[in-house]
C-alpha cells in the first residue's frame, strides 16, 4: 500500500491504494547536492544523471574504510524520495547529482559554493525549464553561503534546503537561514516534530514549512532493488523539492515568491503539536505540513499572503527589529510583538526603495519582533499614510484618501514609554472602515493599496473580559492582510497573523485586573482580488 509519507502529502481527491498524482514534474530538473549516488538502482535508473562535479573533503580517521554502498546511501535515498518511480514524490522529474558530501556525509562551505556556481554556469550555457536545487545539508551560519543562495534564487532557481537536525533555531544554520531558500523541517506520521536521538528537527522563524521526515521509505544503495527507511530534515526537504517540481511542471512560469506562497497555502495547517518546540520558538515556528495542491491549476485567482517574522531586536532601549518581504511580494501590513509587553509599536518605512516593517523596543523591554504580512498582489501600488500624534482626546486617526486605494493594514508607533497606561480605550467610530485609529500619543500608519479589483473589509472581535488571546479570522474566499489590536488595551503584547487568523496576545490574565482596560479587540483586514478571480476564469 501507499507509504505514509506519500499519502500525507496527497490531497484526498487523489488518494488511492497507489500514489499517482496528475503530473509527475516532467518539465522540471532537480539538482541534488549531496553524497555520491547509486544511479543504477532500479528506482532511479534513467531518472538521475550523475554530473562530473565532485568537491568533498577527505574522510576523517586513518582507519576509515570507504565502502561504495555507504558512500552512496544518503544521496541515493534522497534521489528516490524526490523522483523514484515507486516511492518518489515527483515521479516524472529528472535529476542531476553533484557530490559535495563525502562518505561520512561531511562537506565544506567552499565545496557547496563551487557546486552552486557549477549549476549557475550550467544554466547559462544550456537554459532548460524550471530548476529546483535541493540542498539536504546544514552547517553553521555562513554569510557567504547564504549570499550565494540569494544570487542563484534571484536568477530564477528554486532552492530547497533542510532545516537541520540539531533541535535548534534554524536561523543559526546555513543554508537554512537564507531568506531566499525554502527551508523545511521534519514531521512524523503523527504530524509531530521529528526526534532524532537526543536531537531532532530544527525550528523557528527561518523554517518555511514542515514535511514528512521520519521513517521515509526510499531507495537503498545496498543493492539495485533494496529499499530502506531513513529520517531527517533532508528527507523532508526532498518531499518539498518533489512537490515544487510538480507545481512548476504544472505552472512553469511560477516565480519563487509565487511557489513559496502556494506551498504555504496548500499545506495542512495547525496539525503540529507545538509543545515539542521551546516556548519562545512556538509563535515563530510555522505550523504547516507540506502537501500537493488539490488541483495543479486554477490557484492563480487567490490572493496569497504569508507572515514573516523578524529576528529578535535585543533588549536595549532603542533596539529595533525589521521584517522584510521577498522582492516580488508587497508588504500589506506590519505589526509587532513583545513577550514582556514593553514595546513602542511598529511602522512601515521605505528602505532601498521597498517597504519594510520595523518594530521598536521600549525601556525595560526584553526585546520585540516585527511581523510583516507579505502578499502577492500583481500591479499593486501601495503607500503608507501617516498621522502624527493628535492633540484631540479622540485619538489619532488616518485613512486612505487616494481614489481607488483600500486599507490593507494599520500600524501604530509611539515615543512615550508607557503608552496606554491608565487611559480609557479609544473606540473607533462605526461606518469608517477605511481608517486606522490609535492613541493620541501615537503616530498611526495606514497601508493603502491600489490594485485591479482589490477590495478589503475590516472584521473585529472584541472580548470585554481579559483574555490571553483574542482571534478573528477572515472567511472563505478572503485573505488576511492586516492584523492589529484596537488601542486602549494596555496589556496587549502584540498582534500577528497565523494563516488567515489575526491573533492578539495579552499578558497572562491572572496578572491583570479585570477592569474596563481588560477589553481586547482584535482587528483583521480581509481582502480579495476580483481581478485575479476573473483572470483565472478567462484562462480556463
Amino acid at each position: 500500500s501507499i507509504p505514509w509519507n506519500l499519502e500525507r502529502i496527497t490531497p484526498p481527491r487523489y488518494r488511492a491504494d497507489e500514489y499517482q498524482p496528475p503530473d509527475g514534474g516532467s518539465l522540471v530538473e532537480v539538482y541534488l547536492l549531496d553524497t555520491s549516488i547509486q544511479s543504477d538502482h532500479r528506482e532511479i535508473e534513467g531518472r538521475v544523471m550523475v554530473t562530473d562535479f565532485e568537491n568533498v573533503p577527505e574522510e576523517d580517521g586513518t582507519r576509515f574504510h570507504r565502502q561504495a554502498s555507504k558512500c552512496d546511501s544518503h544521496g541515493t535515498h534522497l534521489a528516490g524520495v524526490v523522483s523514484g518511480r515507486d516511492a518518489g514524490v515527483a515521479k516524472g522529474a529528472s535529476m542531476r547529482s553533484l557530490r559535495v558530501l563525502n562518505c561520512q556525509g561531511k562537506g565544506t562551505v567552499s565545496g557547496t559554493l563551487i557546486g552552486l556556481e557549477f549549476i549557475r554556469k550550467s544554466q547559462l550555457v544550456q537554459p532548460v525549464g524550471p530548476l529546483v536545487v535541493l540542498l539536504p545539508l546544514a552547517g553553521g551560519y555562513s554569510r557567504v553561503l547564504n549570499a550565494a543562495c540569494q544570487r542563484l534564487a534571484r536568477a530564477g532557481v528554486v532552492l530547497v534546503t533542510a532545516a537541520g537536525n540539531f533541535r535548534d533555531d534554524a536561523c543559526l544554520y546555513s543554508p537554512a537561514s537564507a531568506p531566499e531558500v525554502i527551508t523545511v523541517g521534519a514531521t512524523n506520521a503523527q504530524d509531530q516534530p521529528v526526534t532524532l536521538g537526543t536531537l531532532g528537527t530544527n525550528f523557528g522563524r527561518c523554517v518555511d514549512l514542515f514535511a514528512p521526515g521520519e521513517d521515509i521509505i526510499g531507495a537503498s544503495s545496498d543493492c539495485s532493488t533494496c529499499f530502506v527507511s531513513q529520517s531527517g530534515t533532508s528527507q523532508a526537504a526532498a518531499h518539498v523539492a518533489g512537490i515544487a517540481a510538480m507545481m512548476l511542471s504544472a505552472e512553469p512560469e511560477l516565480t519563487l515568491a509565487e511557489l513559496r506562497q502556494r506551498l504555504i497555502h496548500f499545506s495542512a495547517k495547525d496539525v503540529i503539536n507545538e509543545a515539542w518546540f521551546p516556548e519562545d520558538q512556538r509563535v515563530l515556528t510555522p505550523n504547516l505540513v507540506a502537501a500537493l495542491p488539490p488541483s495543479t491549476h486554477g490557484a492563480g485567482w487567490q490572493l496569497f499572503c504569508r507572515t514573516v517574522w523578524s529576528a529578535h531586536s535585543g533588549p536595549t532601549r532603542m533596539a529595533t527589529a525589521v521584517a522584510r518581504c521577498a522582492p516580488d511580494e508587497e508588504l500589506l501590513s506590519c505589526s509587532s510583538f513583545s513577550r514582556s509587553g514593553k514595546r513602542r509599536g511598529e511602522r512601515m518605512e521605505a528602505q532601498g526603495g521597498k517597504l519594510v516593517c520595523r518594530a521598536h523596543n521600549a525601556f525595560g523591554g526584553e526585546g520585540v519582533y516585527a511581523i510583516a504580512r507579505c502578499c502577492l498582489l500583481p500591479q499593486a501600488n501601495c503607500s503608507v499614510h501617516t498621522a502624527p500624534p493628535a492633540e484631540a482626546s479622540m485619538g489619532t486617526r488616518v485613512h486612505c484618501h487616494q481614489q481607488g486605494h483600500v486599507l490593507t493594514g494599520c500600524s501604530s508607533h509611539w515615543e512615550v514609554e508607557d503608552l496606554g497606561t491608565h487611559k480609557p480605550p479609544v473606540l473607533r467610530p462605526r461606518g469608517q472602515p477605511n481608517q486606522c485609529v490609535g492613541h493620541r500619543e501615537a503616530s498611526i500608519h495606514a497601508s493603502c493599496c491600489h490594485a485591479p479589483g482589490l477590495e478589503c473589509k475590516v472584521k473585529e472581535h472584541g472580548i470585554p473580559a481579559p483574555q490571553e488571546q483574542v482571534t478573528v479570522a477572515c472567511e472563505e474566499g478572503w485573505t488576511l492582510t492586516g492584523c492589529s489590536a484596537l488601542p486602549g488595551t494596555s496589556h496587549v503584547l502584540g498582534a500577528y497573523a497565523v494563516d488567515n487568523t489575526c491573533v492578539v496576545r495579552s499578558r497572562d490574565v491572572s496578572t491583570t485586573g479585570s477592569t474596563s482596560e481588560g477589553a481586547v479587540t482584535a482587528v483583521a483586514i480581509c481582502c480579495r482580488s476580483r481581478h485575479l478571480a476573473q483572470a483565472s476564469q478567462e484562462l480556463q
Epitope: 499517482q20 528506482e43 515507486d86 537503498s220 543493492c223
Partner: antibody, heavy 119, light 113 residues
Framework: QVQLVQSGAEVKKPGESLKISCKGS????????ISWVRQMPGKGLEWMGL????????HYNPSFQGQVTISADKSISTAYLQWSSLKASDTAMYYC????????????WGQGTLVTVSS | DIVMTQSPDSLAVSLGERATINCRSS????????????LAWYQQKPGQPPKLLIY???TRESGVPDRFSGSGSGTDFTLTISSLQAEDVAVYYC?????????FGQGTKVEIK
C-alpha cells in the same frame, strides 16, 4: 483476481519477427514491474529483463541485450516481448511475471507462451 | 553477476520424509540497511509456470503449505519440505533478486522414491 494472461503459442521461421504479449488485470498495472523469463526445452529459468509500465523504464540482462525488445502499453495494461529476427535457438517457453518495488520477487506469473522457431 | 548454485541436481525422497535443497550465492544477498536476504524459492510443476513459495529467504507466500520452509542467510540457503507429499513433485529454483541481472539456480528436481 490478479492475473497475467499471455498470448498464444507461435510457430515461426528463422529470420521472421514476432511480438508476444502479457496482459495484466486485477491490479494497478503501472505500479508493478513486468519481467520476462525464458525457459528453453528441458532447461532452467533465465531472466531476460524487465519493464516498469509507469514510465517504460527497461533493464535487460546483458545476455539478451540487443536480441529482444521489451515494451508496454499502459493504456491497455499490456507488456510485450519482441524479436526482429528470430533464430532457431529462440525456441523456448517465455513467461511474464510481475514484481512490486517493495517486494521485488515474482509473485504472479503468466501461463507462458511457447515460441517455436523452425525452418 | 551473482551466480546461484543449487545442490543436489535431483532428489528422490519417500512420501512423508524430509526433503532438503541447498542454494549458494556467489556473493552475499543479505543487506544491512534492512537486514533482509534477497532470496526467493519457486516451485515449477510439469507444464506449469513457476509458483512463488518463499521470499526474503524465510517468509512463506500466502497459501503455501507450512511443510515448506526456508532458512539461511548471507550466501547459504536451504528449502525444506518437512513431509513430502505426492503433489510436491516438481523442480525447485532459488533466485536472487537484489542485483541485476536477476539470476536463478539451475534447479533441483524432486521425485518420490
Amino acid at each position: 483476481q490478479v492475473q497475467l494472461v499471455q498470448s498464444g503459442a507461435e510457430v515461426k521461421k528463422p529470420g521472421e519477427s514476432l511480438k508476444i504479449s502479457c496482459k495484466g488485470s486485477g491490479y494497478s498495472f503501472t505500479n508493478y514491474y513486468i519481467s520476462w523469463v525464458r525457459q528453453m526445452p528441458g532447461k532452467g529459468l533465465e531472466w531476460m529483463g524487465l519493464i516498469y509500465p509507469g514510465d517504460s523504464y527497461t533493464h535487460y540482462n546483458p545476455s539478451f541485450q540487443g536480441q529482444v525488445t521489451i515494451s508496454a502499453d499502459k493504456s491497455i495494461s499490456t507488456a510485450y516481448l519482441q524479436w526482429s529476427s528470430l533464430k532457431a535457438s529462440d525456441t523456448a517457453m517465455y513467461y511474464c511475471a510481475r514484481d512490486h518495488w517493495y517486494k521485488p520477487f515474482s509473485d504472479i506469473w503468466g501461463q507462458g507462451t511457447l515460441v517455436t522457431v523452425s525452418s | 553477476d551473482i551466480v546461484m548454485t543449487q545442490s543436489p541436481d535431483s532428489l528422490a525422497v519417500s512420501l512423508g520424509e524430509r526433503a532438503t535443497i541447498n542454494c549458494r550465492s556467489s556473493q552475499s544477498v543479505l543487506y544491512s540497511s534492512n537486514n533482509k536476504n534477497y532470496l526467493a524459492w519457486y516451485q515449477q510443476k510439469p507444464g506449469q509456470p513457476p509458483k512463488l513459495l518463499i521470499y526474503w529467504a524465510s517468509t512463506r507466500e500466502s497459501g503455501v503449505p507450512d511443510r515448506f520452509s526456508g532458512s539461511g542467510s548471507g550466501t547459504d540457503f536451504t528449502l525444506t519440505i518437512s513431509s513430502l507429499q505426492a503433489e510436491d513433485v516438481a523442480v525447485y529454483y532459488c533466485q536472487q533478486y537484489s542485483s541485476f541481472p536477476i539470476t536463478f539456480g539451475q534447479g533441483t528436481k524432486v521425485e518420490i522414491k
